[in-house]
Structure formats: structure tokens, C-alpha cells
Interface confidence: low
Amino acid sequence: QPPPPPPDATCHQVRSFFQRLQPGLKWVPETPVPGSDLQVCLPKGPTCCSRKMEEKYQLTARLNMEQLLQSASMELKFLIIQNAAVFQEAFEIVVRHAKNYTNAMFKNNYPSLTPQAFEFVGEFFTDVSLYILGSDINVDDMVNELFDSLFPVIYTQLMNPGLPDSALDINECLRGARRDLKVFGNFPKLIMTQVSKSLQVTRIFLQALNLGIEVINTTDHLKFSKDCGRMLTRMWYCSYCQGLMMVKPCGGYCNVVMQGCMAGVVEIDKYWREYILSLEELVNGMYRIYDMENVLLGLFSTIHDSIQYVQKNAGKLTTTIGKLCAHSQQRQYR
Amino acid sequence: SAYYPEDLFIDKKVLKVAHVEHEETLSSRRRELIQKLKSFISFYSALPGYICSHSPVAENDTLCWNGQELVERYSQKAARNGMKNQFNLHELKMKGPEPVVSQIIDKLKHINQLLRTMSMPKGRVLDKNLDEEGFESGDCGDDEDECIGGSGDGMIKVKNQLRFLAELAYDLDVDDAPGNSQQATPKDNEISTFHNLGNVH
């Protein structure tokens, strides 16, 4: 093994390097010193480092490590952040289109139901958007509210247009009758199933992406332990104390140090792998009624069919509801 | 027969939005994201190695620093970590991750559980309990086409409704939508390319 080069007799090189880290040279010895106060760069002979320099090296080593960690995760972080934003916007576009398709269906096929239908449809799709973004709304309640609101308008405008406008009292009765008599057949239940399944999946997909960002942010801004700070200093800077400015750490040594410093972070690995594979499984299942794009953009058609179902059974329904809500109607006619 | 929104191109009950070259749907975008994420599946286990390869490490030099002295790169001394009498790596590894990492692990465990719960079996389109009152899940033919549901002749096929890189030229807002016909028969040119939502590399 070749003998190590003699230490810099005047600490000149060390001084000029250290000046870049810390302007002002008051901490750098003029000539090598025993260094008995050093705690990290334990000297084998005279050294060009002081305790204060060691502290500065530790701080710099820690900052280097934090920057390396951030640059390591930059591409991954960008990938998830941008996709989370893109999908959120895309889902909002889908909801907007679905609302517009449904409104257009009402305008083209049931103009007498507008503008009330527009209002109910708008409220429904606002709730859909809020649900996707994480609001604590029950999907079944959203669908029930849509049909509860629509039926009184359908009854008074399509099935029984002779009724006076002041239908406030009968409205409550009609809302109740809507569920009791299964006025829309099984369509509300069908829509509930499709909408709840597709929205749940969409919501969890967005939640998962946002958690991905949180995971990267957490590991991006980790503080490293003192022991780690010392090991990094030893690896990156202690050679300078001997005037060895150009030497680099041995590869195997670096790996041991990094594994020590990263012991906690590497713990995430198992759960990160599982996260990506579980997300893949979810994405593979996002079709048919688990694909909100598919479900929401077809809603106008199912709602249309549900109104047709009501119209088909209008005769029977009008008779039953006439009896059921007679009390409310009499009060209105007075 | 059903009436459709006038702003959609209707062809034999197959609902289409105008064809876009190199069309990119939401589902293809999702799959693309997963493929890219999978290239980062070993991100955390590879971090120590990544950081060493991106910080100054002796690669071509004959000599390297082992934490205590200058040694030959392939010597036994270089392989040792040069930490004896200094820091005990075992002591360093006694401890688990710091609290913020523990918290994020707990959150990952939770989301993984949710994701597994939500990963649905790829079977019938509708739940069995929806088949009462004459609703059939039906067979919609090829996998591209999705059954939206309906009753009897009300079954509709929807083919790739929303092209990912497109948006309707006008937003079908009811105020703007032409309302002079009951039966919808729009022309091809009523639908145009949407704005790009941005590419992720």
C-alpha cells in the first residue's frame, strides 16, 4: 500500500477550500494541530481541522444529503403531482359533460320540465364533484334526492298538467309516493349502484395519488440523525483534514454509510411496492360500472329511460297517487 | 325509441364523440401512469445506491477514502467501513424510522388496504340483485363497449365516450344549446377537438 501523501504543511489548501463553505478563516489552523478536541474526524497525526470546522462540515454534509434526496425524488414527485392534477381536471370535465348531456336530454325531450330539472341535475352533479374530491356525502342520498325532486315536476308537468301551480303541499306527498310506489321502477337503484361504485373507485384513485405526493414530500424533507451526520462528515470531509482534497470515498464504504443513514427510509419500500401494485390492480378494474367516465356519460340515457318508465305506467300511477295524495290536492283546490 | 342530446353524434345506438388522431382516453392515461410508476417500484430500496452513485465516489481512481485513511480501491481495507471505534452501525439501526416516516407508513398501509378492497372482480356489469324487475346485465359484445344499463330495448352501447385530449367546442350549456328540434341529428362538424390537458413525461 503506498504511503499517504504528507499533510499540507501549512493547511493552505484546507483553508482555501473551507473559505468556500464559510467565509472568514478564523476557525482554520494556520499549521497542523494535534486536534485532540475533534469528535468526528479523529486524527492519526496532526490535522488541519478544528472542532468548529467539524461542526460546519456536519451541517454541510447534512444539507448535501437533503439535496441529494430531493434530486433523487424529483422525477417521481413531478410524475405524481402532474398526473394528480391532470386526472382531477379530467374528472371535473367528465362531470361537466355528464351534466350537460343530461340537461340537453331534458331540453330536447322534456322541455316542460326545464328549468326545474336543470336545477336538480346541477345540484346532483355538484354533489358528484364534491364526493370525488372527498366530501362526506352519501351517493344513495344524492340519487334519491335527484329522483325525489324530479318526480313532483314530472307528475305535475307531464302526467297531470291540469294541476294548479301552487303544488307545494302535494310535492311532499309526491316525494314520499315516489319511493313507496317505486315510481321509477328499479332505475334509481341501478343508478345508485353504478354511480356509487364508479365514484368510490375514482375517489380512492385520486386519494391514492395525493398520498403518493405526501409520501415523496415526507421523505424529501427528512432530517437525518446526528449519527448519520457524523458518518457523512467522516465520509465526505474528514479526508480534507489530512489535506487530501481530491480523494473520493470508496464505493462500498459509501453504501454502508447510506444504508445506515437510510435505515428508516428504506422501511417504506415494502409498503411503497404494495402501493404501486395495488394501484395497478385498481386501475385494471376501472372499467364498466367501475369507470366513472363510462357511467356518468351514460346517465342521461338511464334517466331518460326512467322517465319513459314513469310515462308507460302513467295511467295506473295517476290513479294511485290521486288517492294517496288526495288530501293534499283538496287543500290546494280550495 | 330514446331521444338523445342533440350535441352527440348518434349512429345505430352507438354513442360516439368525434374521432381524434392518436386518441388518448382516460383509461389509457391511467395505464400509462401505472407503467411509469412501476419503473419507480424499487425507488426506496434503491435510494442508498442512487445517492452513492450521484455523490462523489471513487470509480476510476486507484485510491479511495475509507473514513480513516487513503486505501487502494480493491483492498480489504476499502471494503471495511472504516467506522470501528467511531460509530456503531448496529446502534444506528436499532431504531426504526423517525415518527413522520412511521406516520406515512401507517397511511400507506391504510390506502393499500382500501385499494385492495376496491379492486373489483371483473365479472358481470351489474350486481345480481339488480336483475329483479327485468333488468338484465346482458352481453355487450367486445370489451371496448360498455353496457350502461336500461330496460329491454333501452340498452345503449357507449363507445369510448370522452376522448382524453378533447373537449366539446361548446360546453353543451343549456343556454347555448340549439333547442329547435326534438329528435337529435347533429352533423359531424358539430363536434371538434378539445383542449389538451397536458402531457406527463
Partner: antibody, heavy 124, light 108 residues
Framework: QVQLQESGGGVVQPGRSLRLSCAAS????????MHWVRQAPGKGLEWVAV????????YYADSVKGRFTISRDNSKNTLYLQMNSLRAEDTAVYYC??????????????????????WGQGTT | DVVMTQSPLSLPVTPGEPASISCRSS???????????LDWYVQKPGQSPQRLIY???IRASGVPDRFSGSGSGTDFTLKISRVEADDVGVYYC?????????FGQGTK
Amino acid sequence: QVQLQESGGGVVQPGRSLRLSCAASGFTFSSYAMHWVRQAPGKGLEWVAVISYDGSNKYYADSVKGRFTISRDNSKNTLYLQMNSLRAEDTAVYYCAKEGTYYYDSSGYWDYYYGMDVWGQGTT
Amino acid sequence: DVVMTQSPLSLPVTPGEPASISCRSSQSLLDSDGYNFLDWYVQKPGQSPQRLIYLGSIRASGVPDRFSGSGSGTDFTLKISRVEADDVGVYYCMQALQTPWTFGQGTK
């Protein structure tokens, strides 16, 4: 809240074996080193063994080295102490204890700490 | 191994009076960062031990401010400014600087 519950104690003949368990709840078990400490009847506390958060590192008191084995199952949130070749002087109440938490110093570093901040009720 | 020696081994105190327990280690418990790796625990009759003080002087959460820890290197003291009836028990010091962790004999 954070809880540790030991079990598995009993009376056995010298030379025989026994396995103690410690069920943990209320904290992220897999993030903390865990200890066994014992107390002979009418005597003081004696530290027995410690295991790192992931089970990769274990340290023992000289009096039990080679006879006792500390282990953990993070999936079950359980700590174990396998005691072989038991002697009369091993008679004691055995406590499991969770190691202390991190502390931050003024420069923003966090550091390790190996004291014990939560103890179980003990098993004899 | 680091040997921990406590004194006195028994300390009768009247409620309302102060109390002081001493603990000495066979080698310094001060680490390079200036922390003393010494804990104080109390074991009340029929109960498990509980931590009072860690790192020489930091009170564990929930511990009344009547308790204080002081000292550095090899000499440490636990003080109770005003003893209450509930403070009856055996007090132990323990070093956590290196394995094996070692306890003092206890002060009753």
C-alpha cells in the same frame, strides 16, 4: 392508548424452557426497539435483552446470553422471549418495555434514545 | 459493564418535606453531544416501573414538576421538592448509554 401485555409465565423445572409473549397496542410497534427487564422476588430491576425495530439487532445481559432469545413478529405486534436451560435464579417477574422516543436538539437533528418509556404489567 | 450505585438505599420522608436521591456511575454517561444517558424510574407498590426522568434532566410527560433530575458525567441526583404520600415506592436510576443497560440497586 399505548399498552403492553405480557403472558406465558409459569412454573417449570430447572433445565426446561418457557416462551414469554408481549402483545403491543396503541403505537406503531414496528418502529420501536423493545426490551425485556426482570425483577427477582424482593430484588431490584435487571435488564435482560433488547431487540431493534426490525429484529435485525439483538443484545443480551451476560447472565442470559446463549440461553435466552429475544424475537418479534411485527405483523402480529408481538414481542417474544424464548427462555431455554432455565435456572432457579431466572425466577422473576418479567416485564416488556417499549424504548423511549426520539428527541430533537437545537440544531434540528433527531437522535436515537434507548431508555424505556412504557412498561407492561409483568408475567411471573 | 457500567456499574450504577445509588444512595441511600432507604429514605424515610415526611409528606411536605424535600427528598434527594443520589446515583453514581462507574464511567461517564455524557455522550459527545452533551446528553447524559441516565433515566430515573419509580416502582410503586404492586405496580410496574414508570419513567420519571430521561436524559438526566428531562421530565417524562405527565410527571409533576415536583420531580427534577440534575447532574452530569458520573454523578446524578433526583430531587422531590415536596414529597406526597403517593410518592411511596422504589426509585431506580438506569444508564442507557451502552449495552448492557444497567440499573442502580434502588432507593426505597
